[in-house]
């Protein structure tokens, strides 16, 4: 009789990323007998939950169940029924919920409580919903990209998995941009740190890593825009804000009450002689860049070197993977190519921002104006954050790789989170087994 491979024992895991602007559900799978190997876990599905982030459900907690239904049902379809009960489900909430918790711990707890009750109704092994720290978000993002790039593997390969993978074991730094926070995580050259708050020590697959990480709350792209508007309206002479970060001809009325809803604008809050103001775009990259820089306080640094706002940042080291909104925005602007220099990116941003709003609407007709209008700001903000915030230069720009997926898995903190919670990243290098995993009968 013909030899047949026994059916592989496959395991699954689910992680929900409850971000500030939306929630995504990720389904991962891996061969059970290889779960301590590096690089065997991969994403089989991403389901984007329709609607805003869970923090917006603070007045609508009764709808959280409906909100999560479609993606949880999708998970039920994708994962074989026989595996449901042993499939762990984790929900991690990030900066949107950190901000809600700052406003009201009670309200944040209420949202998480309803989320937990909703997720407990499914046949999976629900492991809890929690607000992860900014440090965790940075660390797990770093673990994810290096796991997917094969940086933890001790086996040297003669081939590269992805175009920008060098065959050495030097880890990539991680740059993550969300709607409400941004994270920078990397292994600095100098192992000693001036700021213990920003230091993490890992032992992964038999190797020690001393990692620097920081999460800047309120410096995600959406909250940064609110900050900028709140800062600029302070000095406006009337209820018209001529804004260089929006295209010429763009007009939008903003309620002052909406501007001051977020804790991120508290430092700029003042009594204004109007309830509404109108943004009038003038589309000037250079002026927009200058306005954004005013969000970064670089006048104070109690360390040898800082990013901004007095936060320690060691000298940058090695290559970096820039993902989440870093990727989404730059991909929209068609600026993710490895061949595009920082000077060229700046030049293209100048051109993009100066394009009349009517022209932009025609060029990108399928995109809702609400989102389309913000790409000039977002692109400018990314450049400002990377260059002035994190001190990348025209030369070191070439070490930034804008990454959406690696080997079919999204770059982001969720995979690293699951690998950690399922104990799939051993501290020591697993002993290699003499026999192959396939068994034939």
């Amino acid at each position: 009789t013909q030899n047949k491979a026994l059916p592989e024992n496959i395991k699954y895991g689910i992680v929900l990323d409850a971000g500030s602007s939306h929630t995504s559900l990720y389904i991962y799978k891996w061969p059970a007998e290889k779960e301590n190997d590096t690089g065997v876990v991969h994403q089989v599905e991403e389901c984007r939950v329709k609607g805003p982030g869970i923090s917006k459900y603070v007045q609508k907690v009764n709808e959280i169940g409906i909100y999560l239904t479609d993606c949880m049902e999708r998970a039920r379809e994708v994962i074989p029924r026989s595996q449901h009960q042993e499939t762990p489900v984790y929900l991690g909430a990030t900066a949107g919920m950190r901000l809600l918790r700052m406003e009201s711990e009670e309200l944040a707890d209420r949202v998480l409580d309803v989320v937990e009750r909703s997720l407990s109704n499914y046949p999976f092994d629900f492991q809890g919903a929690r607000i992860i720290t900014g440090q965790e978000e940075g660390a797990y993002g770093w673990i994810t990209i290096n796991y997917l790039l094969g940086k933890f593997s001790q086996k040297t390969r003669w081939f590269s998995i992805v175009p920008y993978e060098t065959n050495n074991q030097e880890t990539f730094g991680a740059l993550d941009l969300g709607g409400a926070s941004t994270q920078i995580t990397f292994v600095p050259q100098n192992q000693t740190t001036e700021s213990p708050d920003n230091a993490l020590q890992f032992r992964l697959y038999g190797k020690d890593y001393n990692v620097y990480t920081h999460s800047f709350l309120c410096y995600g792209k959406d909250q940064a825009l609110w900050q900028k508007l709140a800062k600029d309206i302070q000095v406006a002479s009337n209820e018209i804000l001529r804004d260089p970060c929006f295209h010429p001809g763009y007009k939008k009325v903003v309620n002052v009450s909406d501007l001051y809803k977020t804790p991120c604008t508290k430092r700029f809050e003042m009594t204004l002689p109007f309830q509404q103001f109108e943004i009038q775009g003038i589309g000037n990259y250079q002026q927009c860049h200058q306005s954004v820089l005013e969000l970064f306080n670089t006048s104070y640094c109690p360390y040898s070197q800082c990013a901004f706002n007095g936060i320690f940042l060691p000298p940058l080291q090695g290559d970096f993977g820039a993902f989440s909104a870093f990727y989404f925005v730059m991909n929209f602007l068609n600026l993710t190519s490895e061949k595009v220099s920082q000077e060229k990116v700046t030049e293209m941003m100048k051109k993009f921002c100066s394009q009349p709003w009517e022209e932009i609407k025609t060029s990108y007709a399928g995109v809702k104006e609400k989102y389309l209008s913000e790409y000039c700001f977002s692109g400018t903000y990314i450049l400002s954050l990377l260059l002035q915030g994190y001190h990348f230069t025209a030369d070191s720009w070439e070490h930034i790789h804008f990454i959406g997926k690696i080997q079919g898995s999204d770059a982001g903190w969720t995979l690293g989170y699951m690998l950690n919670l399922t104990n799939m990243i051993p501290a020591e290098q697993p002993l290699s087994t003499p026999l192959s995993h396939s068994t034939y009968v």
């Epitope: 609607g51 399928g366 995109v367 809702k368």
Partner: antibody, heavy 124, light 112 residues
Framework: QVQLQQPGTELVMPGASVTLSCKAS????????MHWVKQRPGQGLEWIGE????????NYNQNFKGKATLTVDRSSSTAYMQLNSLTSEDSAVYYC?????????????????WGTGTTVTVSS | DIVMTQTAFSNPVTLGTSASISCRSS???????????LYWYLQKPGQSPQVLIY???NLASGVPDRFSCSGSGTDFTLRITRVEAEDVGFYYC?????????FGGGTKLEMK
């Protein structure tokens, strides 16, 4: 099932204002944009504007700027449209309609669920 | 604003035969991304409108495959094969390429 419930009729005096309601049920209210459409007797459809119930972001047809104001009450899953300085030209059926935009939240979609419509009659 | 033009009436149709309803836009609705931002809605007598077709070629959920749409960037035709009694009403084409979204004046489909 998904429903958008609107009152049947509103009789208002010329020059007055009226606020039309649209109560959503059977889905997550803040997950879908809401649109308002006008239909005058025996005539076609005219788009008034749209609102994102998650954050009150609005877009209006220029023809209705100053005439219509779109708002939502998230706690009751209700969308509202206030019409002011009413004249006989405003006598019409007004529909609210939900926008379905597929998996990409940033893309424009189509109006997949329509309300029952409110007939507004402006008369002294 | 983009103007959508429809003829007010179609030729009366016999049950079980085919019907065609045309629509013209004042500007091409075919975008460089390959999507045509043209939609069809049906308003049956005494009812609210309902979507039939989105982005020119996609059938909305629950709509029978008797309905189809073809066209260039500016000229569109809605075809109904094997017309049924429940298909009577006003057919509206619409665009959402640009704000404000605009509708055609509607075409009344009647039975012989």
């Amino acid at each position: 099932q998904v429903q958008l419930q609107q009152p049947g009729t509103e009789l208002v005096m010329p020059g007055a204002s009226v606020t039309l309601s649209c109560k959503a049920s059977g889905y997550s209210f803040i997950s879908y944009w809401m649109h308002w459409v006008k239909q005058r007797p025996g005539q076609g459809l005219e788009w008034i504007g749209e609102i994102d119930p998650s954050d009150d972001y609005t877009n209006y047809n220029q023809n209705f700027k100053g005439k219509a104001t779109l708002t939502v009450d998230r706690s009751s899953s209700t969308a509202y449209m206030q019409l002011n300085s009413l004249t006989s030209e405003d006598s019409a059926v007004y529909y609210c309609a939900r926008e379905e935009n597929g998996i990409y939240y940033y893309n424009k979609g189509y109006l997949d669920v329509w309300g029952t419509g409110t007939t507004v009659t402006v008369s002294s | 604003d983009i103007v959508m033009t429809q003829t007010a009436f179609s030729n009366p149709v016999t049950l079980g035969t085919s019907a065609s309803i045309s629509c013209r836009s004042s500007k091409s609705l075919l975008h460089s991304n390959g999507i045509t931002y043209l939609y069809w809605y049906l308003q049956k007598p005494g009812q609210s409108p309902q979507v039939l077709i989105y982005q020119m070629s996609n059938l909305a959920s629950g709509v029978p495959d008797r309905f189809s749409c073809s066209g260039s960037g500016t000229d569109f035709t809605l075809r109904i094969t094997r017309v049924e009694a429940e298909d009577v009403g006003f057919y509206y084409c619409a665009q959402n390429l640009e704000l404000p979204y605009t509708f055609g004046g509607g075409t009344k489909l009647e039975m012989k």
